[in-house]
Structures are given as structure tokens and as C-alpha cells.
Interface confidence: low
């Protein structure tokens, strides 16, 4: 099992390498290098669950496998795991966990909470039996988590933007320091971009970098302290 | 989210115990579950996690000779067996989720109300 | 093993006062490909389960006040409550959600006055 991590962990330092063969696991093992980082990014995998939270391990007969970006509502699946949080795979296609189901309404399930303050769980006022057929609506003031759809950044959790992964717009992290990130040549080039990435966090802005060991055509972006 | 734990426990020493944690509300099969032991009046000590999707199962290698973890996906609950027990064992037990906090991390966001288990002949 | 170390084991404060506690790991929990530091801190009431505050050393969880405040990297954190209320009297636990094993402090116990 360990080896079949291996290829998912990025830059790794000596010590976090003999830490993972001796047989532990580091929080971001499963997918939080900075190979893995962006969603527009595909790293090998072995399982779904070495996958962050809103994507799939993908392993097609040829080629190495990767995490992909979950399958939506309506979407064709063959297992649960392709689909995003909240649906299931159902006869191939992906459908709300609870549509076919007679069970109490919860707005927001998986890994989006709506929760009282004193003990963590719903309110009462979220429960109500109800035929769910309909589909769920989010509160509004839910944020949602990497992965999720989103409309606009303040959809989404703190150290995250809402950016455009292939035909929707998903919540991706913000970029840290020494991540590659995309230099707006021109007002309102984002909208061209099938994978668009956050930009960079406070404090941080998207510079060419300058090393010698790459060519200066290849002009390649990362977010550096201003 | 809910993590229903089964009732208090009156073990004989030597008898084995299997406790479970029923989930709800969410995809079973997406999460890490975790046992967490806290002995009375003590801190928290971190037993093992078990993935329901394949039962992949990572134990904290001071239990994995007392603690046996796992799951039934068909009614999304989880199951700890404890062998052997003594009174060392006697203690609070609790299922908690993987908290998947944006990236994937092992904090735990969601706790069911504990089991105590009582090891006393 | 990653050890917690938490300091100080008791303290006794007056509602409205800010009130600090510690936490060391034996080593480093900022993971430096996402700069992100994986330590978590979970208040526990008397009789309860235990809840998580905090996350990624700074970051809280839905729900919880905003006097609830986690700083630090590297190897020391600290939890802040600006201004501690009566509702606040409870176990806190740093956990390094890192490396397995996981693992605990031996917790703060906060009393009030």
C-alpha cells in the first residue's frame, strides 16, 4: 500500500520520505503536493481516497491513472467515488444522495455544515420530512470546500477562490509562495482559461521567474513576496 | 452528520467487546472513520482510522495488538473489537470523521457521544 | 511518534479576561509544499464529547466564536480566547493532524473564577 502512495507525494524532504516507510502517513499524502495542488493538475493515485475532497482516482486501460475532478449531478459514474459530495452513483449516473429516499431534509450534507453553535449539529429547524425528489438548494451562507461549485470567491472557504474548472467554477486554494500562477496579459483574459487558477495570497504577487535554469522564453509565472 | 455509538459496556476481563458507530448524513464511504480511547479524568489517545470504501485500516501500533477495526457498508456503521481487555481498558471510546477541511487532512470534525466501557470481573 | 506538549496544564480566569495556552510538537507540522501547519485544537465540556475549534493551526470551524483564536508554526501554537466567558469552562486538546499516529496533548483545563 505505501508504495502505491509514493508517486502522489511531491517534493518531499529526506526525513518525511523514511517517515512514510516506516509506515506513517502525512496529512497531505494523499494529494498535497504542489503537483497536486491545482485542480487543473492531474497526479497518479491508486484509490479514490488518496484523492482531495471533490475529485476521483481515474485509471483508464492505458496510461498512468489520476485524480480527476468529480462527476456532478446528471453526470455518468460507475462507483459512488466519482461522484461529488452529496451524490451517489445511481444506474450509472450521479443523483443526490437522498432523491430516491423518503429521509429527513438536511440542507447541506457532507463537506459543507450547517451547524448549531453549542453541540455541532443540525438545528431542528433543518429537519423535516420531505420527498426529495427536488434537488437540494445551499444555503446561502454555506461556503463551500475545494471542490466544490461555486459562483462567486466569497462561496467559498477562507484560502480559497471560486475558478473556472473546464465548464463550471469550482472553489480552488489561493496560490502560495513558489506556485505556478497565471499573469493576466489583459483585462478579462481569466474568461479564456478551461483551468483557471486562483491568484496569489496576500502579500504575494505573480512575477516571472528568473533562473537560469529555464529558458526565458518559457517565461514562466510564480507568486513571489512583493 | 451523526455518529450514533452504542451503549455503555460490562466486560469480564479477558472477554472480548465490539462497539460500533452508526454514520449518517453523509457519504460513508468517503471518510476516514477514527476510534479515539480517553481513560477517566485523562487526555485523548488517538487508536486507529478505517476506510470504509475498502476497509483499508491504519492502526497506532501501541493498539494493534488490543483493537480490531471494521465496517459494514451496507448499514454505514463502523465497529471497533477490543480483545482481551483489562482494567487498562476501561475507558470512553469514540468514533470521529476525518474533517475533509478544504484539503485532505486528519483533524476530526464530527464525534459521536462516546461508549464507556467498564472492565471489572 | 509526534509528542504534544501542552502548557499550562490548569488555569483559573475571570469571565472578560483573554486567556493563552501552549502547544509544542517534537517536531515541525508546517507542511512546506502548501504551507500549512496541521494542528488542530478541540475544547471538550464536561460530560461531552470532544469539538473542534481549530484547524490548520488558525483556522476556525464553522460555528465557533470568533474570540476563539489559533496562532503559530512550526512547532509552537498557541490558542487565545480574547475574552473568556463563563460557557468557555472546559478540556482543550492540541492534535497534530499531520502523521500517523495521531496524537494528542495532555490538555489545558480551564476553570472559571
Known amino acids: 500500500k505505501l508504495n502505491s502512495i509514493k508517486s502522489s507525494l511531491g517534493g518531499e524532504t529526506p526525513g518525511q520520505a523514511a517517515n512514510r516507510s516506516a509506515g506513517m502517513y502525512q496529512g497531505l499524502a494523499f494529494g498535497g503536493s504542489k503537483k497536486g495542488k491545482n485542480l487543473g493538475q492531474a497526479y497518479p493515485c491508486s484509490s479514490d481516497k488518496e484523492c482531495e475532497v471533490g475529485r476521483y482516482c481515474h485509471s483508464p486501460h492505458q496510461g498512468s491513472s489520476a485524480c480527476m475532478v468529480c462527476r456532478r449531478k446528471k453526470k455518468r459514474c460507475h462507483r459512488d467515488g466519482m461522484c461529488c459530495p452529496s451524490t451517489r452513483c445511481n444506474n450509472g449516473i450521479c443523483i443526490p444522495v437522498t432523491e430516491s429516499i423518503l429521509t429527513p431534509h438536511i440542507p447541506a450534507l457532507d463537506g459543507t455544515r450547517h451547524r448549531d453553535r453549542n453541540h455541532g449539529h443540525y438545528s431542528n429547524h433543518d429537519l423535516g420530512w420531505q420527498n426529495l425528489g427536488r434537488p437540494h438548494t445551499k444555503m446561502s451562507h454555506i461556503k463551500g470546500h475545494e471542490g466544490d461549485p461555486c459562483l462567486r470567491s466569497s462561496d467559498c472557504i477562507e484560502g480559497f477562490c471560486c475558478a473556472r474548472h473546464f465548464w463550471t467554477k469550482i472553489c480552488k486554494p489561493v496560490l502560495h509562495q513558489g506556485e505556478v500562477c497565471t499573469k493576466q496579459r489583459k483585462k478579462g483574459s481569466h474568461g479564456l482559461e478551461i483551468f483557471q487558477r486562483c491568484d496569489c495570497a496576500k502579500g504575494l504577487s505573480c512575477k516571472v521567474w528568473k533562473d537560469a535554469t529555464y529558458s526565458s522564453k518559457a517565461r514562466l509565472h510564480v507568486c513571489q513576496k512583493i | 452528520v451523526k455518529l450514533q455509538e452504542s451503549g455503555a459496556e460490562l466486560v469480564r476481563p479477558g472477554a472480548s467487546v465490539k462497539l460500533s458507530c452508526k454514520a449518517s448524513g453523509y457519504s460513508f464511504t468517503n471518510y476516514w472513520m477514527n476510534w479515539v480511547k480517553q481513560r477517566p479524568g485523562q487526555g485523548l489517545e488517538w487508536i486507529g482510522m478505517i476506510h470504509p470504501s475498502d476497509s483499508e485500516t491504519r492502526l497506532n501500533q501501541k493498539f494493534k495488538d488490543k483493537a480490531t477495526l471494521t465496517v459494514d457498508k451496507s448499514s454505514s456503521t463502523a465497529y471497533m473489537q477490543l480483545s482481551s481487555p483489562t482494567s487498562e481498558d476501561s475507558a470512553v471510546y469514540y468514533c470521529a470523521r476525518e474533517g475533509r477541511l478544504g484539503l485532505r487532512s486528519y483533524a476530526m470534525d464530527y464525534w459521536g457521544q462516546g461508549t464507556t466501557v467498564t472492565v471489572s470481573s | 511518534d509526534i509528542v504534544m506538549t501542552q502548557s499550562p496544564s490548569s488555569l483559573a480566569m475571570s469571565v472578560g479576561q483573554k486567556v493563552t495556552m501552549s502547544c509544542k510538537s517534537s517536531?515541525?507540522?508546517?507542511?512546506?509544499?502548501?504551507?500549512?501547519?496541521?494542528l488542530a485544537w478541540y475544547q471538550q465540556k464536561p460530560g461531552q464529547s470532544p469539538k473542534l475549534l481549530v484547524y490548520?493551526?488558525?483556522t476556525r470551524e464553522s460555528g465557533v466564536p470568533d474570540r476563539f483564536v489559533g496562532s503559530g508554526s512550526g512547532t509552537d501554537f498557541t490558542l487565545t480566547i480574547t475574552s473568556v466567558q463563563a460557557e468557555d469552562l472546559a478540556d482543550y486538546f492540541c492534535q497534530q493532524h499531520y502523521i500517523t499516529p495521531l496524537t494528542f496533548g495532555a490538555g489545558t483545563k480551564l476553570e472559571i473564577k
Open positions: 517536531q515541525s507540522l508546517l507542511n512546506s509544499s502548501n504551507q500549512k501547519n496541521y
Open positions: 490548520f493551526a488558525s
